[in-house]
Interface confidence: low
C-alpha cells in the first residue's frame, strides 16, 4: 500500500465500471484508479464489490471483506477486455442485486456505489440508469458517480445523490489519479477512537467519537452513536453535537465490569451502519478516582 | 408504448392443463419481470407467481405451487403460463402484468387484457 | 403470508366529494432499511384489468390524476380521492410487495351516491 490518506469506515463498497468498447484503449487506467483507491479502504470489516457493465452487467466479485479474494478480484479486473454497449443500468442492477440479498439476511450494514463511465448516456439508456441507481437507492445505498472525457454531467447528477456525488475527470482517463484523494473524503465514513475507551462500571459519561465524515449524512439529525454490548443488545444513542470529525455522544450506563460496547454509528436513524474495530470497555473505579 | 397482448379464452374439462402466452411489446422484455394474477367471476384479485425474465428465477403461490410452470421466451418477447390439474375453481380470468423490476418481484405497472380459462366437465 | 384487509367493501360518495379507503396489513410493509412501505394501489373498472394508481405507499404512477393520493406508513394505509369524478367508479384494490406471496386487499367498491 502506498500510503497517504486512507478510510478506517466499515461499510458495503460497490465498484460499478463501464467496459464499453469507448474504455477499450483506457482499461488499464481505470484498472490503476480502482485499485489504488481499493487499496485505501482497509478496515476489516469492509466489504467490497467489482462490477462491470457493457450490453451485459457482471459481477467480476461479489461483496467480501477476505482481503485475498479482493486482490484475485483485482486481477480479474486487470483481465477485462472491454466491448459492447454502456448499458450502466446493468451495473447498478448487480450492486441492488447484492444489496437486497445482504439486507434480507438481517445485515445492516452502510452501502456506498462508485459508478464509473465515459461518455454521454443515449435517452433511453439515461431513463434505464437513472431509474436502476433510484432502485438502489431505495435499497438504501449511496451513490456517487465518476465521469471521464465525454460525460453529461447533468445526467450524472441525477444518476448519483446529488451534483455533490459527482466527480468529473474533465483530462481524460490519466487524470483519474487525480481525484482519488477527493473521492476517498467524501466517500469515506469512519470512526477512528472512542474518547475515553475505558468508563467506569455503572456510571454515566459522555463519549467523544473521533473519525471523519460524519456530516455526509443527508441529514445530520439522523445521526446516531451505536453501541453493540457483548456482541449482542445494541444501543442507539442521540448524539449532543455533530461535526464532520467527532461526535459528542452519551454513553450507555454499563453495569458490570468487563463489559465491551463496540461502536458504530448510523447515519440514518439506525437503518443501517459504519462499523468500527473501537471497543469501549468498563472498568472498576474506586470512589474519589 | 408498453402493451402485453394475451392469447384467447379457453374452454376445458377438469384434470386437463392450460396454457396461456402473453406477448408484451413497447419496452425491453428481460428488463421487467412478469407476474401472474387471476380473478375468479365477481371476485377480487389472486397473485399466482411471477418469473424474472432475466434469470429465470420464479416465485410461487402455495395454492398453485407444482401445478403452475412460468416461462419466458427472450427472442419473441413473450411470457407463458400453464397451470396444470385444473379444477372448477380454478374457473377465472387470467392476468400477465408487468413487474417493476427484473429480479425481486414488486408492484405491477402494465397489465395484459385477460385470458378467460372455463373449467367445466 | 401477509394478509391484507380493505375497508369499507363498498362506498358510496357524491360526485366532488372525497373518497377514503382504508387497507390494513397482518404485518408491517415498511422495510426498515430504506423506510419505504412495500405497498401499491390499483383501479379495477368494469371490464378492465386492474391499472396502477399509487406505489411505495404514496408515490403517483405518471398519468395519475392529483386528486389521488396515498398515505400511511407500517400496517395501516389510505388511498384517498380528494374530488370524486365520474370516471372514478371502480373497484380498487391495495397490495403489499414486502414479501412473497404477494398479496392484494379484498377490494372496494366506489359508486356515486
Known amino acids: 500500500e502506498d500510503g497517504g490518506p486512507a478510510c478506517y469506515g466499515g461499510f458495503d463498497l460497490y465498484f460499478i465500471l463501464d467496459k464499453s468498447g469507448s474504455v477499450l484503449h483506457h482499461w488499464n487506467e481505470i484498472y490503476y484508479f480502482v485499485e489504488q483507491l481499493a487499496h485505501k479502504f482497509i478496515s476489516p470489516q469492509l466489504r467490497m464489490s467489482f462490477i462491470v457493465f457493457s450490453t451485459r452487467g457482471t459481477t467480476l466479485m461479489k461483496l467480501t471483506e477476505d482481503r485475498e479474494q479482493i486482490r484475485q478480484g483485482l486481477e480479474e479486473l486487470q483481465k477485462v477486455l472491454p466491448g459492447g454497449d454502456t448499458y450502466m443500468h446493468e451495473g447498478f442492477e448487480r450492486a441492488s442485486e447484492q444489496i437486497y440479498y445482504e439486507n434480507r439476511q438481517g445485515y445492516r450494514t452502510a452501502s456506498v456505489i462508485i459508478a464509473l463511465t465515459d461518455g454521454e448516456l443515449h435517452e433511453d439508456l439515461f431513463f434505464y440508469s437513472e431509474r436502476e441507481a433510484n432502485r438502489s437507492r431505495d435499497l438504501g445505498a449511496i451513490v456517487y458517480c465518476v465521469g471521464v472525457k465525454d460525460f453529461n454531467e447533468t445526467q450524472l447528477a441525477r444518476i448519483a445523490d446529488s451534483k455533490d456525488h459527482v466527480f468529473p475527470v474533465n483530462d481524460g482517463f490519466q487524470a483519474l489519479q487525480g481525484i482519488i484523494h477527493s473521492i476517498l473524503k467524501k466517500s469515506c465514513i469512519e470512526i477512528l477512537a472512542a474518547e475515553p475507551s475505558t468508563i467506569c462500571a455503572g456510571e454515566s459519561f459522555q463519549v467523544v467519537v473521533r473519525g471523519n465524515g460524519f456530516r455526509h449524512a443527508r441529514n445530520v439529525d439522523r445521526v446516531l452513536c451505536s453501541f453493540k454490548i457483548n456482541d449482542s443488545v445494541t444501543l442507539n444513542e442521540k448524539p449532543f453535537s455533530v461535526e464532520d470529525t467527532y461526535l459528542l455522544c452519551p454513553a450507555p450506563i454499563l453495569k458490570e465490569v468487563g463489559m465491551k460496547a463496540a461502536l458504530q454509528v448510523s447515519m440514518n436513524d439506525g437503518l443501517s451502519f459504519i462499523s468500527s474495530s473501537v471497543i469501549i470497555t468498563t472498568t472498576h473505579c474506586s470512589d474519589g478516582s | 408504448q408498453v402493451q402485453l397482448v394475451q392469447s384467447g379464452p379457453e374452454v376445458k374439462k377438469p384434470g386437463a392443463p392450460v396454457k396461456i402466452s402473453c406477448k408484451t411489446s413497447g419496452y425491453i422484455f428481460d428488463d421487467y419481470g412478469i407476474t401472474w394474477v387471476r380473478q375468479a367471476p365477481g371476485q377480487g384479485l389472486e397473485w399466482l407467481g411471477w418469473i424474472s425474465t432475466y434469470n429465470g428465477k420464479t416465485s410461487f403461490a402455495q395454492k398453485v405451487q407444482g401445478r403452475l410452470t412460468m416461462t419466458t421466451d427472450i427472442s419473441t418477447n413473450t411470457a407463458s403460463m400453464e397451470l396444470r390439474g385444473l379444477r372448477s375453481d380454478d374457473t377465472a380470468l387470467y392476468y400477465c402484468a408487468r413487474v417493476f423490476s427484473r429480479y425481486i418481484p414488486f408492484y405491477f405497472d402494465s397489465w395484459g387484457q385477460g385470458t378467460l380459462v372455463t373449467v367445466s366437465s | 403470508d401477509v394478509v391484507m384487509t380493505q375497508s369499507p367493501d363498498s362506498l358510496a360518495v357524491s360526485l366532488g366529494e372525497r373518497a377514503t379507503i382504508n387497507c390494513k396489513s397482518s404485518?408491517?410493509?415498511?422495510?426498515?432499511?430504506?423506510?419505504?412501505?412495500?405497498l401499491a394501489w390499483y383501479q379495477q373498472k368494469p371490464g378492465q384489468p386492474p391499472k396502477l394508481l399509487i406505489y411505495w405507499a404514496s408515490t403517483r404512477e405518471s398519468g395519475v390524476p392529483d386528486r389521488f393520493s396515498g398515505s400511511g406508513s407500517g400496517t395501516d394505509f389510505t388511498l384517498t380521492i380528494s374530488s370524486l369524478q365520474a370516471e372514478d367508479v371502480a373497484v380498487y384494490y391495495c397490495q403489499q410487495y414486502y414479501s412473497t406471496p404477494l398479496t392484494f386487499g379484498g377490494g372496494t367498491k366506489l359508486e356515486i351516491k
Open positions: 404485518q408491517s410493509v415498511l422495510y426498515s432499511y430504506n423506510n419505504k412501505n412495500y
